[in-house]
């Protein structure tokens, strides 16, 4: 990708229907730069088009650089409303950049994945609940709307909508990342 | 106050089988991932399997994948070790672990349980 | 699979002694490393996560530092209690690992 990212380096089941979840303050714990790829090891990359940022979903010849992206992780609180015992879960939410001033943002009217350039406070669509699959992989949920994932479709990313009762582990909502 | 409470564990002879349980109360159990973490007498700590909280992914250490299974049944909020084909290097106290994270395994085990002893020997 | 290597293996020390063990890891894990205390018969309890994050619970004498590949748990002023076995535990990926512990002795 052209554009260089300014990196702030810093020191440091599902998501239940209708849960509250606040992001327990305005820095991530910890942030990382990597690449993203899918399950079937196709890489996603970002290209400036017409002053907007597209996202693709697609081999890599061997000698091309994969794209970065910052992953800033948050803890958000979790309470356990459903058990009335009050224990506070965290759930580790993450935003991703691509590149700089711009984030990854959910578009559930539209099913889509877009790169928005935003100010922090950035708004929840640009937040996900991060997964721990089988494989070493991972998966983004979206925080606006419990069961949605970004997930793969047609080359693209998209939003993809997973039952509750389903193994989670289809294989097109499954990423990898690579900081090497 | 969350409760974690491991059973099942016992003499078995080699090749044998034993299925260990996990009674948990005080958290929202489907909601997070579970593990199941040994440590041989003397020995330091060795993890075994994850579950995440609806049953749909499951991870392994090398050292059993085949011969054990994990599961969970959320609607009795209990977590399951199936051990197949045991050896002797088998022989350690087994916790059961909860997840810090929800839905990942990326922030540690924030509550074990008290242990059962598994030990295998002819 | 990721190594992790814990050092001291043991360490003598005395009550308000500042305490510093170290964990490397074979390869990069961004900063997802937990420390536990375990005592004789007990089960591991949870101090530190994400490198750098204390516990609920867990005192502030208590702190972790590093990322990458190369970690610290400082105990600031060594307490009674405090004498026990710490291990690190990489939470990067899959199989998880631990270090081989420090067991953390009076003096």
């Known amino acids: 990708m052209g554009s260089s990212h300014h990196h702030h380096h810093h020191s440091s089941g599902l998501v239940p229907r209708g849960s509250h979840m606040s992001i327990t303050g305005i820095s991530p714990i910890t942030e990382s730069l990597a690449s993203l790829s899918t399950y079937n090891d196709q890489s996603i990359t970002f290209a400036l088009e017409d002053e907007s940022y597209e996202i693709y979903v697609e081999d890599l010849k061997k000698d091309k650089k994969k794209d970065k992206v910052l992953l800033s992780y948050y803890e958000s609180q979790h309470p356990s409303s459903e058990s009335g015992d009050g224990v506070d879960g965290k759930m580790l939410m993450v935003t991703l950049s691509p590149t700089k001033d711009f984030w990854l943002q959910a578009n559930n009217k539209e099913h889509s994945v877009e790169l928005h350039k935003c100010e922090k406070p950035l708004p929840d669509q640009a937040f996900f609940v991060l997964h721990n699959r089988s494989f070493n992989c991972v998966s983004f949920e979206c925080k606006t709307d419990p069961g949605v994932f970004i997930g793969v479709k047609d080359n693209h990313l998209a939003l993809i909508k997973v039952d509750y009762s389903e193994n989670l582990g289809s294989e097109n909502i499954l990423f990898k990342l690579s900081e090497t | 106050e969350v409760q974690l409470v491991e059973s099942g564990g016992g003499l078995v002879q080699p090749g044998g089988s034993l299925r260990l349980s996990c009674a948990a109360s005080?958290?929202?159990?489907?909601?997070?991932?579970m593990s199941w973490v040994r440590q041989a007498p003397g020995k330091g700590l060795e993890w075994v399997s994850s579950?995440?909280?609806?049953?749909?992914?499951?991870n392994y250490a090398d050292s059993v994948k085949g011969r054990f299974t994990i599961s969970r049944d959320n609607s009795k909020n209990t977590l399951f070790l199936e051990m197949n084909s045991l050896r002797a290097e088998d022989t350690a106290v087994y916790y059961c672990?909860?997840?810090?994270?929800?839905?990942?395994?990326?922030?540690?085990?924030?509550?074990w349980g008290q242990g059962t002893l598994v030990t295998v020997s002819s | 699979d990721i190594q992790m290597t814990q050092s001291p293996s043991s360490v003598s020390a005395s009550v308000g002694d500042r305490v510093t063990i170290t964990c490397r890891a074979s390869q990069g894990i961004s900063s997802w490393l937990a420390w536990y205390q375990q005592k004789p018969g007990k089960a591991p309890k949870l101090l530190i996560y994400?490198?750098?994050s204390l516990q609920s619970g867990v005192p502030s004498r208590f702190s972790g530092s590093g990322s990458g590949t190369y970690f610290t748990l400082t105990i600031s002023s060594l307490q009674p209690e405090d004498f026990a076995t710490y291990y690190c535990?990489?939470?990067?990926?899959?199989?998880?690992?631990f270090g081989g512990g420090t067991k953390v002795e009076i003096k």
């Open positions: 005080g958290f929202t159990f489907s909601s997070y991932v």
């Open positions: 579950i995440s909280g609806n049953g749909g992914s499951t």
């Open positions: 672990a909860k997840s810090l994270g929800t839905t990942t395994t990326f922030l540690g085990f924030d509550y």
């Open positions: 535990q990489q939470a990067n990926s899959f199989p998880l690992t």
């Open positions: 994400a490198a750098s």
